[in-house]
């Protein structure tokens, strides 16, 4: 903390301008009025203060606003935002998307910091849901943002926001997250025609149930192997050989290269070897001819 000393004669700041960058830390403390600083925050960001100097300015703002900064100040923090702790940010009430964008811009190109994570959390909680504009903004700055949310948090994403999601935004999502996002995507894209619908829904299919995969197999979609490998194993297992063939179209040949990996491996184990042979891919491990398959889970349900 800077020792409080009287401001030297003629050095009292009447406005926030470039001359202040040459003030020593104690002079900034003594000669810059906190209220002046708050009203001219837009100028602060235009002056390349050192972080040591920004510490002094932050201290002044903290004294002026012990309960948290107003949005008029927050919007113009610039590099000063990097000096904020998550505890500081928890005191804020950020409602403007412009404010959010301005602060994310400061951190652009870097991994999401605890400060940014706290800011986003405050913003989204304040809005009550992840609306399309917010999601658009967040995924533009952090493509992996969506997959950093818990399934519970994702449940607040309205289906209309799904239009903002790009395939790369879902790269790191796990099946639990896709389970929540898939029904929303299905609802969002429901009025699209077959081929257009598949292009949009494809990235979300890791959350699709068996019946939807069966329906897709009737639409000549030609799913690629990368998408197939991300499907839920429990959703793939009940599909017949004919359905998988229709689902993959010309990509069905790729099954051979993936026969030892889930979900292909588990699916093969559930198919009759006869049926697998019809593919002509040399897939092995199916149920030998003449064997009877008992579905024990069904039997338990009946008893």
């Amino acid at each position: 903390e800077v020792e409080k000393t009287a401001c030297p004669s003629g050095k009292k700041a009447r406005e926030i301008d470039e001359s202040l960058i040459f003030y020593k830390k104690w002079e900034l403390e003594a000669c810059v009025d906190a209220a002046l600083l708050a009203t001219q925050m837009d100028r602060v960001n235009a002056i390349p203060f050192t972080y040591e100097q920004l510490d002094v300015l932050k201290h002044k703002l903290d004294e002026l606003y012990p309960q948290g900064y107003p949005e008029s100040v927050i919007q113009h923090l610039g590099y000063l935002f990097l000096k904020m702790s998550p505890e500081d940010i928890r005191k804020w009430n950020v409602t403007s998307l412009e404010t959010l964008k301005a602060l994310l811009e400061v951190n652009k190109g870097h991994e999401m910091s605890p400060q940014v994570a706290t800011l986003i959390d405050r913003f989204v909680k304040g809005r009550g849901q992840l609306d399309k504009d917010t999601l658009d903004t967040l995924t533009a700055f952090y493509p992996g943002y969506l997959c950093s949310l818990s399934p519970e948090e994702l449940s607040s994403v309205p289906p209309s926001s799904i239009w903002a999601v790009r395939p790369q935004d879902l790269d790191t999502c796990d099946p639990r997250q896709l389970d929540v996002l898939y029904p929303k995507a299905r609802l969002a894209f429901q009025n699209m025609n077959g081929s257009e619908y598949f292009v949009k829904i494809q990235s979300f299919l890791g959350g699709a149930p068996t019946e939807d995969l069966k329906a897709l197999s009737q639409q000549n979609v030609s799913m690629d192997l990368a998408t197939f490998m991300k499907l839920r194993t429990d959703a793939v297992l009940p599909l017949t050989v004919a359905e998988v063939q229709k689902l993959l179209g010309p990509h069905v040949e790729g099954l051979k290269a993936e026969e030892r990996h889930r979900p292909v491996r588990d699916w093969i184990l559930r198919q009759r070897q006869d049926d697998l042979d019809t593919l002509g891919l040399g897939l092995q491990g199916g149920i030998p001819n003449g064997y009877l398959v008992l579905d024990l889970s069904m039997q338990e349900a009946l008893s």
Epitope: P48, T50, Y51, E52, L54, Y79, K83, G109, H110
Partner: nanobody, 117 residues
């Protein structure tokens, strides 16, 4: 992080010139502004000049018209050209940088400038 090495200091007569260099290494892509400071014996450190990544620069009133700061982004180097040197310019000159990724100033070890009368 960013590492800084200053050079170019030395002993010079009043009225003479020196050119200081500050070479940055490490995560140089995150450097925003480069600064020259100085600290004379028994005095506080003071900012002498700065130059931003966009080329905006300024120098303190005490050295205006005598010192100029420049920067070569390709070489990650800042220069301080010091002309018409005075004995009161004697100090250790330090380079520092502000980065966009980490909210602390990174500093060099300093280079001694001595101006004799």
């Amino acid at each position: 992080q960013v590492q800084l090495v200053e050079s170019g200091g030395g002993l010079v007569q009043a009225g003479g010139s020196l050119r200081l260099s500050c070479v940055a290494s490490g995560r140089t892509s995150t450097i925003d502004t480069m600064y020259w400071h100085r600290q004379a014996p028994g005095n506080e450190r003071e900012l002498v000049a700065y130059v931003t990544s966009r080329g905006t620069s300024n120098v303190a009133d005490s050295v205006k018209g005598r010192f100029t700061i420049s920067r070569d982004n390709a070489k990650n180097t800042a220069y301080l050209q010091m002309n018409s040197l005075k004995p009161e310019d004697t100090a250790v000159y330090y380079c520092s940088v502000r980065t966009t990724s980490y909210p602390v100033d990174f500093w060099g070890q300093g280079t001694q400038v001595t101006v004799s009368s």
